[in-house]
């Protein structure tokens, strides 16, 4: 079930997912001057079974001006540098991202991809927060948010994070120490 709202905004903080639950959709967006190829996929979709999950469909962009065909290639480092995940200025995927059952990893870039990725999360998805550069994290609890469903309405839990203006940055989980895996989180309707 799709989460019909967005993860909370925390002042001076950004969020990202370590892995994406099955059902997550990623818009096939192209950078300015490019468009999706005709009859190309609108979305990539995280699908799979209990043992393996992967992204269905491939996003492909072509020049808006010409009709030439496109190929799937990884952008050069300078192109990659500008990209960001939805509402995140952080790097793409931590190298030690856990392989969670029923989850997909960050999809690889596609040629002429837009700079911002637009994900459509599903119930049970967890995202992690970190303070932006120049701000320090004061934790009152987990710096994470989970999409839950109650009475048919979806909502994200409030991350317990305050970012103060001191020159020390916090890291995403996995970039400092292992975290509890989100796979045990409830994805069914919360009891009313």
């Amino acid at each position: 079930e799709l989460c019909d709202d967005d993860p909370p905004e925390i002042p001076h903080a950004t969020f990202k997912a370590m892995a994406y639950k099955e059902g997550t959709m990623l818009n096939c967006e192209c950078k300015r001057g490019f468009r999706r190829i005709k009859s190309g996929s609108l979305y990539m979709l995280c699908t799979g079974n209990s043992s393996h999950s992967s992204w269905d469909n491939q996003c492909q962009c072509t020049s808006s001006a010409t009709r030439n065909t496109t190929k799937q290639v990884t952008p050069q480092p300078e192109e990659q540098k500008e990209r960001k995940t939805t509402e995140m200025q952080s790097p793409m995927q931590p190298v030690d991202q856990a392989s969670l059952p029923g989850h997909c990893r960050e999809p690889p870039p596609w040629e002429n991809e837009a700079t911002e990725r637009i994900y459509h999360f599903v119930v049970g998805q967890m995202v992690y927060y970190q303070c932006v550069q120049g701000y320090r994290a004061l934790h009152r609890g987990p710096a994470e948010s989970v999409c839950k469903m109650t009475h048919g309405k979806t909502r994200w839990t409030q991350p317990q994070l305050i970012c103060t203006g001191e020159m020390e940055t916090s890291q995403f989980p996995g970039e400092e120490k292992p975290q509890a895996s989100p796979e045990g989180r409830p994805e069914s309707e919360t009891s009313c």
Partner: antibody, heavy 116, light 106 residues
Framework: QVQLVQSGAEVKKPGSSVKVSCKAS????????MHWVRQAPGQGLEWIGY????????EYNQKFKDKATITADESTNTAYMELSSLRSEDTAVYYC?????????WGQGTLVTVSS | DIQMTQSPSTLSASVGDRVTITCSAS?????MHWYQQKPGKAPKLLIY???NLASGVPARFSGSGSGTEFTLTISSLQPDDFATYYC?????????FGQGTKVEVK
């Protein structure tokens, strides 16, 4: 109490445009996405798309991508949907519905009739 | 897109009858939601997340199912229940509805 009040019925010529409004009250407008749904005469329901009022981000059903433009005005708690290049097939009742999951509140509907 | 196929399209029944409407999704979905619509009115949420009754909905309505097959049941049809019923999925975009089942007086 939550209310979604839509603008009145419209009769339009083919090729013209129309802008339907949906004024929300009784809840925090920016906390919920606003969806739009179409119902042609004697037909079923079709999802058009939604807007996140806070950021203005929209997501459309590809079928309506070139037909509908959804906007929102935070200052008046109003969502809008503009339909362009109208054709007789666009004759329908258009509903706004509060998102955040299932559509628990709906506008009363706006009948748009396209006729020469 | 996920296609939703409701059956039957029209159902003729009498007050007191047990009525069952089925909705089949072209792909597996998490939950099914059901709406009731009366002529000239906006749809009204009836059942959410497959089996939960919306606020104020009588207990004669029930929902069940999983995967691709879902059912809406009215245990004892009442005069107020003659209407059109729509199933709805919001597991993936675009969101889609069934074509509707009209419950009419026999």
């Amino acid at each position: 109490q939550v209310q979604l009040v839509q603008s009145g019925a419209e009769v339009k010529k083919p090729g013209s445009s129309v802008k339907v409004s949906c004024k929300a009250s009784g809840y925090t407008f920016t906390s919920y996405r606003m969806h739009w749904v179409r119902q042609a005469p004697g037909q079923g329901l079709e999802w058009i798309g939604y807007i996140r009022p806070k950021k203005g981000y929209t997501e459309y059903n590809q079928k309506f991508k070139d037909k509908a433009t959804i906007t929102a005005d935070e200052s008046t708690n109003t969502a809008y949907m503009e339909l362009s290049s109208l054709r007789s097939e666009d004759t329908a009742v258009y509903y706004c519905a509060r998102g955040g999951g299932v559509f628990d509140y709906w506008g009363q509907g706006t009948l748009v009739t396209v006729s020469s | 897109d996920i296609q939703m196929t409701q059956s039957p399209s029209t159902l003729s029944a009498s007050v007191g009858d047990r009525v069952t409407i089925t909705c089949s999704a072209s792909s597996s979905i998490s939950y099914m939601h059901w709406y009731q619509q009366k002529p000239g009115k906006a749809p009204k949420l009836l059942i959410y997340t497959t089996s939960n009754l919306a606020s104020g909905v009588p207990a004669r309505f029930s929902g069940s199912g999983s995967g691709t097959e879902f059912t809406l049941t009215i245990s004892s049809l009442q005069p107020d229940d003659f209407a059109t019923y729509y199933c709805h999925q919001r597991s993936t975009y675009p969101l889609t509805f069934g074509q509707g089942t009209k419950v009419e007086v026999k």
